[in-house]
């Protein structure tokens, strides 16, 4: 038994890592390997992770944490039984990848603007919650043409976008993504996508 | 209540051993890490030895390194100071104490917040 | 190791006066924010060290207010606001984030 691809993980900053690596041939993740944890730090014990499958060849583990501080760096075992197939170290803080914006929700019924709202997946005490930046994505399902990336860089997890710069009549779709600048993070994965009907029109005398 | 009885001091020749005892009681022993410190007659405190709940981790100073081996057994609430190749030097009242929460992650530290009432080791000829 | 330096090593007080000891370490304890591995144990005549400040600045259980701890990374300071009796013996600081646990030399408090 062999790794191929050695594990990556990424921290939500929060109370999960999950770590991804790919075997050399088909494996059964959940059976025949364990992923091992520990903090280094005074008195700490070793934590087990059991791995997924994540596609014939990949595992996935996803490792409970206490919340992530600067100084948090963990050793990784990969067993298989008997067999240390694999060890590394992770550092939490140097490897963030945020959770994903919930609650996408687009509100139309504010005269000519369409108001799309979201709420910050961290609590107020995450290092994170002041830090998120957006990407809204808002694209048409009627007009392949179409898809804009709107950058969110204030704290409020708002967007505005002017009703009249969309076409009547047809629907869109938008989704949501966060990222934290100070902490030099990737992309979270993005929001699940809700859809709405744009029917507003100009005034006539507009037309 | 939350204690700590420590037992097994007593009269040693040097290069003799003892094993001295602490019987916790009152909280969750196997959650905790356990820690030795000793008090040479007239002296400061010095640590000699931390172990983690499940016993896997263990810590010595480099005075006591090779010669003591501090365990514990969880079913029994019980931890150990087994003492060989015992020295002149190793003369003091040995206390154990309760340390940090050593089940979750990252250790939850709350001081050493019990300390047994000590056991005094004598080494001489 | 980490080396922890205490001051005064011996400090008379007058009963009802506030007293002061100093601890410094010779590398940070400071393990995250408001994460100082530092302590603060009272050790009387005859008995066993019993705890007084955990983590820098909090107070242990069953331990007077006028007790306090403050301080970061190297420097700490244990300050009692009003001295009684009852708080004569030795106090020593002590760091715990890594092993070895070190503790400073240890302050006598007297009675004046």
């Known amino acids: 038994m062999k790794v191929l691809q050695e594990p990556a993980c990424v921290s939500d900053y929060m109370s999960i890592s999950t770590c991804e690596w790919k075997m050399g041939g088909p494996t059964n993740c959940s059976a025949e390997l364990r992923l091992l944890y520990q903090l280094v730090f005074q008195s700490s014990e070793t934590h087990t992770c059991v791995p997924e499958n994540n596609g014939g060849v990949g595992c996935v583990c996803h490792l409970l944490m206490d919340d992530v501080v600067s100084m948090d760096n963990y050793t990784l075992d990969l067993w298989a039984g008997q067999q240390l197939l694999w060890k590394g170290s992770f550092k939490p803080s140097e490897h963030v990848k945020p959770r994903a914006p919930g609650n996408l929700t687009v509100h139309t019924n504010v005269s000519d603007t369409v108001l799309l709202t979201w709420s910050n997946p961290y609590p107020p005490d995450n290092y994170l919650y002041n830090d998120l930046t957006y990407a809204v994505n808002i694209w048409s399902e009627n007009d392949p043409a179409y898809s804009r990336i709107h950058n969110v860089t204030y704290l409020k997890p708002t967007l505005r976008i002017p009703a009249s710069t969309l076409k009547s009549g047809i629907s869109y779709r938008a989704r949501v993504r966060a990222w934290a600048q100070h902490y030099n993070t990737t992309w979270s994965e993005w929001s699940p996508s809700t859809k709405w009907y744009n029917s507003y029109r100009e005034p006539f005398e507009q037309r | 209540e939350v204690q700590l009885v420590e037992s097994g001091g007593g009269l040693e020749q040097p290069g003799g051993s003892l094993r001295l005892s602490c019987a916790g009681s009152?909280?969750?022993?196997?959650?905790?890490?356990m820690t030795w410190v000793r008090q040479a007659p007239g002296k400061g405190l010095e640590w000699v030895s931390s172990?983690?709940?499940?016993?896997?981790?263990?810590y010595y100073a480099d005075s006591v390194k090779g010669r003591f081996t501090i365990s514990r057994d969880n079913s029994k609430n019980t931890l150990y100071l087994q003492m060989n190749s015992l020295r002149a030097e190793d003369t003091a009242v040995y206390y154990c104490?309760?340390?940090?929460?050593?089940?979750?992650?990252?250790?939850?530290?709350?001081?050493?917040?019990?300390w047994g009432q000590g056991t005094t080791v004598t080494v001489s000829s | 190791d980490i080396v922890m330096t205490q001051s005064p090593l011996s400090l008379p007080v007058t009963p009802g006066e506030p007293a002061s000891i100093s601890c410094r370490s010779s590398?940070?304890?400071?393990?995250?924010?408001?994460?100082?591995?530092v302590d603060w144990y009272l050790q009387k005549s005859g008995q066993s060290p019993q705890l007084l400040i955990y983590?820098?600045?909090k107070r242990a259980s069953g331990v007077p207010d006028r007790f306090s701890g403050s301080g970061s990374g190297t420097d700490f300071t244990l300050k009692i606001s009003r001295v009684e009796a009852e708080d004569v013996g030795f106090y020593y600081c002590?760091?715990?984030?890594?092993?070895?646990?070190?503790f400073g030399q240890g302050t006598k408090l007297e009675i004046k």
């Open positions: 104490a309760k340390d940090r929460l050593s089940v979750t992650v990252r250790p939850r530290y709350y001081g050493l917040d019990v």
């Open positions: 009152g909280f969750t022993f196997r959650d905790f890490a």
């Open positions: 172990v983690s709940g499940s016993g896997g981790n263990t």
């Open positions: 590398q940070s304890v400071l393990y995250s924010i408001g994460y100082n591995y």
């Open positions: 983590l820098g600045n």
């Open positions: 002590m760091q715990s984030l890594t092993s070895p646990y070190t």
